[in-house]
């Protein structure tokens, strides 16, 4: 058993049928010695008396808010949550496996640049009685500071019969140098509590591996005289790290016909312009990627050919 | 990217081309190592990230773009003195900081070159003959060093009398390649920045 926060405790249980559970001793936070009784949640049934209460915690029915009273007055509370260990592995019931980029990916994180700011998100099908708390650091043995905001509900989607809820959080490394070569990964830890179930999820990454630039901005077409060709031009996104000559991007320019079956013409360039043939009803799209470290491509920025 | 690429002008800066070749070569070598050594811990998540140049060179600090020198998190008090002549410096633009930066890069390359050559000698003794260093990568390191053209004492190749532990050697190769790839990215960024300025 360990303390999650004041008056909230997590009981770790080896979870299998007929398991013996864990013996827990609760102590009433009071100078009083006599006439103390204990109850669980809203029930008025007295579970025991005295300054301490010893309970055998086996199942969720044994978890909840234990309260000690004296003469009708509440003295203190202890909330017991359960953390299930199933065959040596902590349970992951609360969050959905996003399966990207690999199986058992519960937290996904992205950064728009090298400033040390990043966003993480996760999915769940649970809509109520759900709380999250996020902590982060650079490294784990001698951790350096990363400050995270509160997790917020960022999207709701319907997937088949189920509703899916996306939560996200923004974090900022306290003293980040965009040019630094990372040798210690960022660690992100999410505590999730659903009713009386506690779970924790972690992710470990280097900012360089989660970079995904915003799409190029100001995408424009300039027709070339007496030609089917057009000059496409664009700019680096505002959110990208500066100076751009140091934090350079490379670009992919795509000409896509109206039909998805039509052949796509693609050109790669390090410049912020390219000359392509603009077909009728086609559209031109451009996306960006760090020129020197191949992390994710940005989403496409698009303009119609006409 | 096996599709048409609009190639940029080589520019005035002779080292840019070499640094781009270096990054390409080390990235290919790392990819090859990860595939060949699939049963070894060779991925970024599995290895310890060690920097053999730590406390010996200060490339990131010495080569910091002017725009980032205002960022206190980027300024490290490490001071390292370097020789300051080199053919990549366009004489008019030669500045003390730029010379420090390029000599720091040269020292990095020299250190990695020695490590890689020592390691290759061990790998050649492996009866499994599972993996060797790409000669192209070693050649590209050499070319960039020549382009930088700094006078510096030659570091003798480390020789070891004890029987090599091939498992440890292969894991060390992965660690070195990951670190060298990160340094090659920094070198490429620096060359691109210097080329633009």
């Amino acid at each position: 058993i360990w303390e999650l926060k004041k008056d909230v405790y997590v009981v770790e249980l080896d979870w299998y049928p007929d398991a013996p559970g864990e013996m827990v001793v609760l102590t009433c936070d009071t100078p009083e010695e006599d006439g103390i009784t204990w109850t669980l949640d809203q029930s008025s049934e007295v579970l025991g008396s005295g300054k301490t209460l010893t309970i055998q915690v086996k199942e969720f029915g044994d978890a909840g808010q234990y309260t000690c009273h004296k003469g009708g007055e509440v003295l203190s509370h202890s909330l017991l949550l359960l953390h299930k260990k199933e065959d040596g592995i902590w349970s992951t019931d609360i969050l959905k496996d996003q399966k990207e980029p690999k199986n058992k990916t519960f937290l996904r994180c992205e950064a728009k640049n090298y400033s040390g700011r990043f966003t993480c998100w996760w999915l769940t099908t649970i809509s109520t009685d759900l709380t999250f708390s996020v902590k982060s650091s650079r490294g784990s043995s001698d951790p350096q500071g990363v400050t995270c905001g509160a997790a917020t509900l960022s999207a709701e989607r319907v997937r088949g019969d189920n509703k899916e809820y996306e939560y996200s959080v923004e974090c900022q490394e306290d003293s980040a140098c965009p040019a630094a070569e990372e040798s210690l990964p960022i660690e992100v830890m999410v505590d999730a509590v659903h009713k009386l179930k506690y779970e924790n999820y972690t992710s470990s990454f280097f900012i360089r591996d989660i970079i995904k630039p915003d799409p190029p901005k100001n995408l424009q077409l300039k027709p070339l005289k007496n030609s089917r060709q057009v000059e496409v031009s664009w700019e680096y996104p505002d959110t990208w790290s500066t100076p751009h000559s140091y934090f350079s991007l490379t670009f992919c320019v795509q000409v896509q016909g109206k039909s998805k079956r039509e052949k796509k013409d693609r050109v790669f360039t390090d410049k912020t312009s390219a000359t392509v043939i603009c077909r009728k009803n086609a559209s031109i799209s451009v996306r960006a990627q760090d020129r020197y470290y191949s992390s994710s491509w940005s989403e496409w920025a698009s303009v119609p050919c006409s | 990217r096996n599709l048409p690429v609009a190639t940029p002008d080589p520019g005035m800066f002779p080292c840019l081309h070499h640094s781009q070749n270096l990054l390409r070569a080390v990235s290919n070598m790392l990819q090859k190592a990860r595939q060949t050594l699939e049963f070894y811990p060779c991925t970024s998540e599995e290895i310890d990230h060690e920097d053999i140049t730590k406390d010996k060179t200060s490339t990131v600090e010495a080569c910091l773009p002017l725009e980032l020198t205002k960022n206190e998190s980027c300024l490290n008090s490490r001071e390292t003195s370097f020789i300051t002549n080199g053919s990549c410096l366009a004489s008019r633009k030669t500045s003390f900081m730029m010379a420090l930066c390029l000599s720091s890069i040269y020292e990095d390359l020299k250190m990695y070159q020695v490590e890689f050559k020592t390691m290759n000698a061990k790998l050649l003794m492996d009866p499994k003959r599972q993996i060797f260093l790409d000669q192209n990568m070693l050649a590209v390191i050499d070319e960039l060093m020549q382009a930088l053209n700094f006078n510096s004492e030659t570091v003798p190749q480390k020789s070891s009398l004890e029987e090599p532990d091939f498992y440890k050697t292969k894991i060390k190769l992965c660690i070195l390649l990951h670190a060298f790839r990160i340094r090659a990215v920094t070198i490429d960024r620096v060359m691109s920045y210097l080329n633009a300025s």
Epitope: Y16, D87, G88 | -
Partner: antibody, heavy 115, light 112 residues
Framework: QVQLVQSGGGVVQPGRSLRLSCAAS????????MHWVRQAPGKGLEWVAF????????YYADSVKGRFTISRDNSKNTLYLQMKSLRAEDTAVYYC????????WGQGTMVTVSS | SYVLTQPPSVSGTPGQRVTISCSGG????????VKWYQQLPGTAPKLLIY???QRPSGVPDRFSGSKSGTSASLAITGVQAEDEADYYC????????????FGTGTKVTVLG
């Protein structure tokens, strides 16, 4: 004490269907994940499928994906394995099993796929 | 499709020490725990060892388990006639959990 009693096995022709049941007692069935494991005659153990305590997630071995469906009825304390498009290579003793560091197995039920 | 490799058979005379190996990889035994089962002819498997080296109550202390790197082993010190059975190791792959990975199985023969 914990008990898992299996039923539903038998002889079936290739391409036909069969449903196995596993009735649980002696524990809170709705709190625990459950597996199906099979063993072909004279061969080793092969995992078939898993279902979460609440039925929300199901996992299958590649060899049965798209043909077998694991399900549970927590109100009846029963685990099921619906097997469709049966093949000769599905011939085996099928076991249900609880998920956890200490596990309990059903007695097994024989499924024979033969024409 | 078996990723955990066991020797097909091992044998010993009563009182001898018998060991069974189970060889896996970094993503299964290397990053998780191992169980061992005993299966007597015509019966369901019985748990002998969980969590690499833990014995459930009721399992004789002549059975012991260990794990090192990407391999595990089961030792029977002072093997007895009633230990003649098939033995299976089991683990999980970190990418496909909760799918169970079973070893190929080992037939233990106790020589008269």
């Amino acid at each position: 004490q914990v008990q898992l009693v299996q039923s539903g096995g038998g002889v079936v022709q290739p391409g036909r269907s069969l449903r196995l049941s596993c009735a649980a007692s002696g524990f809170t069935f709705s709190s625990y994940g459950m597996h199906w494991v099979r063993q072909a005659p004279g061969k080793g153990l092969e995992w078939v499928a898993f279902i979460r305590y609440d039925g929300s997630n199901k996992y299958y071995a590649d060899s049965v994906k798209g043909r077998f469906t694991i399900s549970r009825d927590n109100s009846k304390n029963t685990l099921y394995l619906q097997m469709k498009s049966l093949r000769a290579e599905d011939t085996a003793v099928y076991y249900c099993k609880t998920h956890g560091s200490h596990d309990n197995w059903g007695q097994g039920t024989m499924v024979t796929v033969s024409s | 499709s078996y990723v955990l490799t066991q020797p097909p058979s091992v044998s010993g005379t009563p009182g001898q020490r018998v060991t069974i190996s189970c060889s896996g990889g970094r993503s299964n035994i290397g990053s998780g725990t191992v169980k061992w089962y005993q299966q007597l002819p015509g019966t369901a498997p019985k748990l002998l060892i969980y969590g690499n080296d833990q014995r459930p109550s009721g399992v004789p202390d002549r059975f012991s388990g260990s794990k090192s790197g990407t391999s595990a082993s089961l030792a029977i010190t002072g093997v007895q006639a009633e230990d003649e059975a098939d033995y299976y190791c089991q683990s999980y792959d970190r990418g496909t959990h909760p799918a169970l990975l079973f070893g190929t199985g080992t037939k233990v023969t106790v020589l008269g």
